[in-house]
Interface confidence: low
Amino acid sequence: DTEIKVNPPQDFEIVDPGYLGYLYLQWQPPLSLDHFKECTVEYELKYRNIGSETWKTIITKNLHYKDGFDLNKGIEAKIHTLLPWQCTNGSEVQSSWAETTYWISPQGIPETKVQDMDCVYYNWQYLLCSWKPGIGVLLDTNYNLFYWYEGLDHALQCVDYIKADGQNIGCRFPYLEASDYKDFYICVNGSSENKPIRSSYFTFQLQNIVKPLPPVYLTFTRESSCEIKLKWSIPLGPIPARCFDYEIEIREDDTTLVTATVENETYTLKTTNETRQLCFVVRSKVNIYCSDDGIWSEWSDKQCWEGEDLSKKTLLR
């Protein structure tokens, strides 16, 4: 019995299509597959950013794979051919590994890249990113922001920069059609007459950086002698009611501070007849059913009741 062997895939490479971190891994079939014409060859692909402790592993019959990477670091990948046991009358046969790497050669020292990059998707409608210039960069340094997400033909440059002292320090994005629940890639690079500027790459999903508007129309309703119902309305905009969590802050008679987190637009508060003053504020956040993360809204305007029977009056802001 001769030992069955198979070659690794050929021409294994990582291709950068210019999508700021979304890369193509591609290869060709191994040499000498003639003996296995009736067989479907599979490939085991492993890849990671250099420095990551874990490999991502994919088994595929295709000759390509696509995924997102952090271009601030290098990428390493390896692949081998798998012959299923059906093809070999026995156990699965694996080739040796073919390996490849990819990295963008860094320009400039780390201190020149943008600092404190911060992106917020206001009310799930308007994306705004801001940053600070690198440490000690001169006023002739300018930064440019490029972005891409699946659905765009190519990376686009910001067209509405926020400026300070003539330098770009932020970007107001246009309407981003069908851009949530997928990776959103950003590169901020720069240029200067007297030194190279380090590029920075960022990846996030827009639904995870939403900052909603605060709730509106806060009201009180006395439900019984010892219960008051607090109510409010969701803000205008595209975020559905099912996507909100709320945090309430309640002050009774300027002493007791109650905080609570709720999922509905109401909260029932136990009180005593001696309550002379009641104030509350509410803020909102996208909940775990609609995103993995989010940013609390600003607090609503404060709503207070003072020295009047709550059963006689419902207050609107």
């Epitope: 250099i50 420095g51 670091k73 020292i109 780390p110 201190e111 020149t112 440490i135 000690g136 030194k195």
Partner: antibody, heavy 119, light 111 residues
């Protein structure tokens, strides 16, 4: 939060070696350098060198170049500093300290490890 | 090696006073338009704490009363209004060239 936890105090004889560890947590280990700084009793601070936790590249103070070795283990986010051919003047507190780029300073420090060299 | 000379080596002051510590480098610590000068505070038995980096940028969470200035060879750390917890030893440190070096320290004591 960022934490750098160093190994315990050591007493060594002249001519021996000491290996101090510094375990990092609360941040992406491979994004930073780790520096080693020592301070003799009642004295000032002396930078010994640093290691890039990502690539393992080292920069040593020439004063210690032949005696110091800095290594890192990315699987445990731990950095090690070994000093050989110890002499009494190596008695000091040894600190690890995290740094990003050169201009960012050393922003988080370990609690320090006292190494006493005495016959 | 770049030598850093701090002055004064000790300083007596009262709570509420303004304190100024200077650090002079034997050669310029500027490069790429950045001053590679940092300031640390150290209390007995504790590791140093970064106050100022790149000559004038505040470390995270440090009170606004600490400020740094200077470029080239001459640098200053200023504490605008001394608080009881500010009495400690202060070090300057350059990170322009290996080996990184520290000043000899300034001990700030209560008058």
């Amino acid at each position: 939060q960022v934490q750098l936890v160093q190994s315990g105090a050591e007493v060594k004889k002249p001519g021996a070696s000491v290996k101090v560890s510094c375990k990092a947590s609360g941040y992406t280990f491979t994004n930073y350098w780790m520096n080693w700084v020592r301070q003799a009793p009642g004295q000032g601070l002396e930078w010994m060198g640093r290691i890039d936790a990502y690539a393992g590249e080292t920069h040593y103070n020439q004063k210690f170049k032949d005696r110091v070795t800095m290594t890192r283990d990315t699987s445990t986010s731990t950095v090690y500093m070994e000093l050989s051919s110890l002499r009494s003047e190596d008695t000091a507190v040894y600190y690890c300290a995290r740094g990003y780029g050169d201009a960012y300073g050393m922003d988080h420090w370990g609690q320090g490890t006292l190494v006493t060299v005495s016959s | 090696d770049i030598v850093l000379t701090q002055s004064p080596s000790s300083l007596s002051a009262s709570v509420g006073d303004r304190a100024t510590i200077t650090c002079r480098a034997s050669e310029s610590v500027d490069n790429y338009g950045i001053s590679f000068m940092n300031w640390f505070q150290q209390k007995p038995g504790k590791p140093p704490k970064l106050l100022i980096y790149a000559a004038s940028r505040q470390g995270s969470g440090d009170p606004a009363r600490f400020s740094g200035s200077g470029s080239g060879t001459d640098f200053t750390l200023t504490i605008s209004s001394l608080q009881p917890e500010d009495f400690a030893t202060y070090f300057c440190q350059q990170s322009k060239e290996v080996p990184w070096t520290f000043g000899g320290g300034t001990k700030l004591e209560i008058k």
